[in-house]
Each structure stands twice: as structure tokens, then as C-alpha cells.
């Protein structure tokens, strides 16, 4: 399987909410011996590999925000901790995987990564990730609502197994 990022750039005004999205592409094993681990974190555009570094999102680590379930099951993050920080990650039956950030501030601007790991009994992990940029703007140049910019088809196809 691969991960696609429908949008590579989100430009939002301060105070707005935004939902960043990744999508699982390709066949997903639903067997009893496979588990999917999905999470979000902030990162930096490395010279060699984007999404290598795992920084917290609003002080929550990738482990705080992870989802853990069988293939194409729906899941949500544990509500208490994440919601206290205005965050919620979710996954639906169709391979969509998102994080919602409420009441954006300028400090939320940066590179965000989704990570999906297929964990299978006796096998090495299959890891894939996607990256997108969030720009939070203030002042007269800020949009009134979030504006999203689609990834080029090449970009979304090029997110490979890490």
C-alpha cells in the first residue's frame, strides 16, 4: 500500500480549525495477524528525507496521537489528552486518515507528517508516510477560511514506503 496526500498546502487564518488528511491507497490486508498503526507529528524538510524527525504537535508526541486498529477499521484518538490540546486524529473505513486542529495560531505553522505502519506477526514493519505544509496567517492578507492546494498527481504518487 501507499499513502497519498490529497493536499500539499493548507493556508488558514488564525483562529480557524483545519483538518489535515492522508489517504491509504492500494490493497490493505484485513487478516487477524495484521495491525495498523497510524499517527501524526511535526517535522522539518530534511536534506535527505522528509518526515524523519518526529516533533510534537502542540506538546503531544506521535505516541500520544496514534491510532491502532485492524485494516480499514474506524478509530479515534483517546479524546481527553488530545482534545485538551484542541486536537483529534481519526481514521475511517475508506482509508482516510486525518488530524483536526482547532483554534489555529501562528505557532501551528509548519510541516506535518502522517505515518502508517503495517505490523504483522513475524514480519518487518511496512512503513509509509505523507507530508503537507500548514501556513497560518494573520492580518489583512490572511484568507477568511482555509485554502487548500492539491498535491500534484506526481507528488501524491511519489510518497513511497519509508
Amino acid at each position: 500500500f501507499k499513502v497519498a496526500t490529497p493536499y500539499s498546502l493548507y493556508v488558514c487564518p488564525e483562529g480557524q480549525n483545519v483538518t489535515l488528511t492522508c489517504r491509504l491507497l492500494g490493497p490493505v490486508d484485513k487478516g487477524h495477524d495484521v495491525t495498523f498503526y497510524k499517527t501524526w507529528y511535526r517535522s522539518s524538510r530534511g536534506e535527505v528525507q522528509t518526515c524523519s524527525e518526529r516533533r510534537p504537535i502542540r506538546n503531544l508526541t506521535f505516541q500520544d496521537l496514534h491510532l491502532h486498529h485492524g485494516g480499514h477499521q474506524a478509530a479515534n484518538t483517546s479524546h481527553d489528552l488530545a482534545q485538551r490540546h484542541g486536537l483529534e486524529s481519526a481514521s475511517d473505513h475508506h482509508g482516510n486518515f486525518s488530524i483536526t486542529m482547532r483554534n489555529l495560531t501562528l505557532l501551528d505553522s509548519g510541516l506535518y507528517c502522517c505515518l502508517v505502519v503495517e505490523i504483522r506477526h513475524h514480519h518487518s514493519e511496512h512503513r509509509v508516510h505523507g507530508a503537507m505544509e500548514l501556513q497560518v496567517q494573520t492580518g489583512k492578507d490572511a484568507p477568511s477560511n482555509c485554502v487548500v492546494y492539491p498535491s500534484s498527481s506526481q507528488d501524491s504518487e511519489n510518497i513511497t514506503a519509508a
Epitope: E53, H66, A162
Partner: antibody, heavy 119, light 107 residues
Framework: QLQLQESGPGLVKPSETLSLTCTVS??????????WGWIRQPPGKGLEWIGS???????YYNPSLKSRVTISVDTSKNQFSLKLNSVTTADTAVYYC???????????WGQGTLVTVSS | DIQMTQSPSSLSASVGDRVTITCRAS??????LAWYQQKPEKAPKSLIY???SLQSGVPSRFSGSGSGTDFTLTISSLQPEDFATYYC?????????FGQGTKLEIK
């Protein structure tokens, strides 16, 4: 603060079974998204990964030891264990238990326990 | 199995020196490489993950680079507490494997 503590006999006879337990405190061993592993280090030598256990019960073993190794978990005691059977003197080493998150390296280690195989 | 080869196996240096240790994987491991520091009678301590990302709490004089098969750990200005043995480890695929270690000694 997560802490891991190895325990078990420091001396095992050749051909017998080495049994070690790692007790985890400051965190739940059943938390999803973590592996619990064993690594060993013979005196004066380098590190060797023995195997890991995922939070959902999946196991992963080093092929060089697979026929002799079992890693298991006791969630009620917040412990996981290593059994290595048919030991020889080559199995003399410091044995470490450690934790690693999904798609990450070993970030928390026990202090290690020396196991000597000798008659 | 993926073999990890470190060089040098030992080196002598002085406080304030810049030191580089290299690690080569027998096949590509992307950026799934970690570096550890181990002092006598102690457990290894994680310094670097994902080839170049600093583990929380590790001084910024430590840095890592590389991708694929060739990696380096650099200590920009050696401090007395840095004299130890350093190991690389690949976590690209099972079985996880370590380099043989580089012992860093005081000149």
C-alpha cells in the same frame, strides 16, 4: 519516567534454560504502539538483538537464535520474559531489556544483568 | 541479514576535537539508523534516530547524517564525558543489527 529492570539467575548450567524477566514501571506494558525487546552483549563484545514482542502479542526473533528463544508477556504483572534453552558458554552475556516505539529505535533500556553459563 | 560495519573500531582524541565515526550498511536502509553511546558497565543510550534526528536531551554537539548505506556520527567538540563506545543500529528490517562498535579514548 519509564523504568525497566531485569531479574533472573546470574548463573546457568550448560544445556539448561536461561530465564529472565523484565519488570516495567512508570508505564503500561499493554500500551499500544510499543515493542518490548531483549538485547545481549557478551563480555567485551558488541550488541546483539535477540527479539521483540509487540503490544498486541506478535513476536519477532533473531533467526540465529529463533529455535531456542521464547519471549512472552504477563500484562497483569507488567512484565515480559525471555527464555533461551540449550545454553552454551557462548550465551554468557549481559542481557538488557528495552523498549522501542513503532518505527523507532530502542529509546529506553534496563540496566542489564550478567548471566554466566558455566558448569 | 543486514550487516553494519563501523569504522574505525577505536580512535584516540582530545577534548575539543571534532570526531567522525562512520557506519556502512550491507544494503540500503533508507534513514532507519540509530546511534548509541555506551559507557562501561552501563546500558546504551540513544543519541540519534532516523540517521540525523537528535534524541531529546542529547547535546547539540552530536549530529548524524547519511541515508541509504553510508552514515556518519559527528561530535563537533569533544567533552570529557563523551569518551565511550559508540554503536550504530539499523531498524529498517528484522533482524535488527548493530555495528561492532567504535571505542573513543582519550589521547
Amino acid at each position: 519516567q519509564l523504568q525497566l529492570q531485569e531479574s533472573g539467575p546470574g548463573l546457568v548450567k550448560p544445556s539448561e534454560t536461561l530465564s529472565l524477566t523484565c519488570t516495567v514501571s512508570g508505564g503500561s506494558i499493554s500500551s499500544s504502539g510499543y515493542y518490548w525487546g531483549w538485547i545481549r552483549q557478551p563480555p567485551g563484545k558488541g550488541l546483539e538483538w535477540i527479539g521483540s514482542l509487540y503490544s498486541s502479542g506478535y513476536t519477532y526473533y533473531n533467526p540465529s537464535l529463533k529455535s531456542r528463544v521464547t519471549i512472552s508477556v504477563d500484562t497483569s504483572k507488567n512484565q515480559f520474559s525471555l527464555k533461551l534453552n540449550s545454553v552454551t558458554t557462548a550465551d554468557t552475556a549481559v542481557y538488557y531489556c528495552a523498549r522501542h516505539p513503532v518505527a523507532m529505535n530502542f529509546d529506553d533500556w534496563g540496566q542489564g544483568t550478567l548471566v554466566t553459563v558455566s558448569s | 541479514d543486514i550487516q553494519m560495519t563501523q569504522s574505525p573500531s577505536s580512535l584516540s582524541a582530545s577534548v575539543g576535537d571534532r570526531v567522525t565515526i562512520t557506519c556502512r550498511a550491507s544494503q540500503g536502509i533508507s534513514s532507519w539508523l540509530a546511534w548509541y553511546q555506551q559507557k562501561p558497565e552501563k546500558a546504551p543510550k540513544s543519541l540519534i534516530y532516523a540517521a540525523s534526528s537528535l534524541q531529546s536531551g542529547v547535546p547539540s554537539r552530536f549530529s548524524g547524517s547519511g541515508s541509504g548505506t553510508d552514515f556518519t556520527l559527528t561530535i563537533s567538540s569533544l567533552q570529557p564525558e563523551d569518551f565511550a563506545t559508540y554503536y550504530c543500529q539499523q531498524y529498517n528490517s528484522y533482524p535488527y543489527t548493530f555495528g561492532q562498535g567504535t571505542k573513543l579514548e582519550i589521547k
